[in-house]
Interface confidence: low
Amino acid sequence: MRTEAQVPALQPPEPGLEGAMGHRTLVLPWVLLTLCVTAGTPEVWVQVRMEATELSSFTIRCGFLGSGSISLVTVSWGGPNGAGGTTLAVLHPERGIRQWAPARQARWETQSSISLILEGSGASSPCANTTFCCKFASFPEGSWEACGSLPPSSDPGLSAPPTPAPILRADLAGILGVSGVLLFGCVYLLHLLRRHKHRPAPRLQPSRTSPQAPRARAWAPSQASQAALHVPYATINTSCRPATLDTAHPHGGPSWWASLPTHAAHRPQGPAAWASTPIPARGSFVSVENGLYAQAGERPPHTGPGLTLFPDPRGPRAMEGPLGVR
């Protein structure tokens, strides 16, 4: 028996295309629309549950609904990693898993989903109003994050399927090329739709068997971007016994290769020093956000002007690719 909560889905209306377009004419728009939706708006889902047998034990499950290659997953407590959250675990598909108290067990469930068990007793247990966030760094989609917490009722046994809640990172420098193509396609699609808008015809009902008919996930690009931009992060605020800080992992995380901006994530700071040349210099904690590597902290006097990267035990090959992805 367990208590579960999921972040609410951003459910778009099903697109109804007006106009008397023939089936052939529809193929391109539907393909473009599919591209705009599936490639342009990957999603992250978060599921938080409290074990009824052990009320101080939480399980967080997160997954990435996208076609890209995941290069890093960060689970944080208390809000998004870049906005005050503190890291509980970092999972890298090749370089291993690091976790901190009160995280007990972090693991990959599938190639695109992870789970994390948090333990605690008394003062050190996570509270039901704690927000847990999962951030997926992937290529070519970039960084996507979603957050969730337990519902106010916290009734053991409450269960629902996990639902996606995307966050748009509009400044992903590493995917400008892909974005440009998609943007062009989306604009072209809108142009086609507008051109045929005033032609009277019955509303199109996409065929269930048609590969060009994405249903639940097919939402217009404008809706997608607006919804994502207007939701800085999806979270449910709940209440329970007074929250404790004993569950926090300090300032966000480990000294992993190219990881997350932790130092700047918890205090208002000046802009991070950005470096675009992936040259390993010394171990440090840097960001893969936006396809660039951000040095997360002051550079010691002996460190050169190059990028501060974690020296990967597997050698220089580990640093290939825009996000360390080969």
């Epitope: 503190t86 690091r98 976790q99 800080l245 300090p250 995380g253 171990g283 904690f285």
Partner: antibody, heavy 119, light 107 residues
Framework: EVQLQQSGPELVKPGASVRISCKAS????????MHWVKQSHGKSLEWIGY????????GHNQNFKSKATLTVDKSSSTAYMEFRSLTSDDSAVYYC????????????WGQGTSVTVSS | DIQMTQSPASLSASVGETVTITCRTS??????LSWYQQKQGKSPQLLVY???TLTENVPSRFSGSGSGTQFSLKINSLQPEDFGSYYC?????????FGGGTKLEIK
């Protein structure tokens, strides 16, 4: 210059509690973990736990979870460790150590506080 | 918890010699390992972090190597000030643990 100044030696009775302080200077106190380490006479080092001054978040070695309480006073840039229910096994030198925010290293250590538990 | 096995427990060497201290971990800790030097009655001093990165102002005769579960600290051309105790420590998540230490004495 980064400095961690610990409180002086303590002689306490079994069953009592002791509170050790570690005053930090020369850096932004809330930006770094503060760790506590125990060293019994002639023995190795034992990690007790850490506190992150920015939000009070802590992590403990389970062996010390019921024994040590870690707190900070941000206004004075001071970290505290309270040790309770002391026994002769708790007689040791206790160090505070700053850990850089990338979790790479404990780069600065206090001079140590000697605690002797004796009746 | 990750166990740290440091060897040898004690070591006698002469000035000018080269010595190597090893540290083995029970689990893969990648390169999340530090080496400390401690003199009698003093606090530990960080020598090496991330397995092989030398701390500022530490002489280049010290060098760290290894990854995964096997690590070593090498001291070339021992100097009188190098004698003392050495400890390895992992920082691959909590709880951090230290090795049992190596006491380096003058022969």
């Amino acid at each position: 210059e980064v400095q961690l100044q610990q409180s002086g030696p303590e002689l306490v009775k079994p069953g009592a509690s002791v509170r050790i302080s570690c005053k930090a200077s020369g850096y932004t106190f809330t930006d770094y973990n503060m760790h506590w380490v125990k060293q019994s006479h002639g023995k190795s080092l034992e990690w007790i736990g850490y506190i992150y001054p920015y939000n009070g978040g802590t992590g403990h070695n389970q062996n010390f979870k019921s024994k040590a309480t870690l707190t900070v006073d941000k206004s004075s840039s001071t970290a505290y460790m309270e040790f309770r229910s002391l026994t002769s096994d708790d007689s040791a030198v206790y160090y505070c150590a700053r850990e850089d925010f990338r979790h790479e290293k404990m780069d600065y250590w206090g001079q140590g506080t000697s605690v002797t538990v004796s009746s | 918890d990750i166990q740290m096995t440091q060897s040898p427990a004690s070591l006698s060497a002469s000035v000018g010699e080269t010595v190597t201290i090893t540290c083995r971990t029970s689990d893969n800790i990648y390169v999340y390992l530090s080496w400390y030097q401690q003199k009698q009655g003093k606090s530990p001093q960080l020598l090496v972090y991330n397995a092989k990165t030398l701390t500022e102002n530490v002489p280049s005769r010290f060098s760290g190597s290894g990854s995964g579960t096997q690590f070593s600290l090498k001291i070339n051309s021992l100097q009188p000030e190098d004698f003392g105790s050495y400890y390895c420590q992992h920082h691959y998540g909590t709880p951090y643990t230290f090795g049992g230490g190596t006491k380096l004495e003058i022969k």
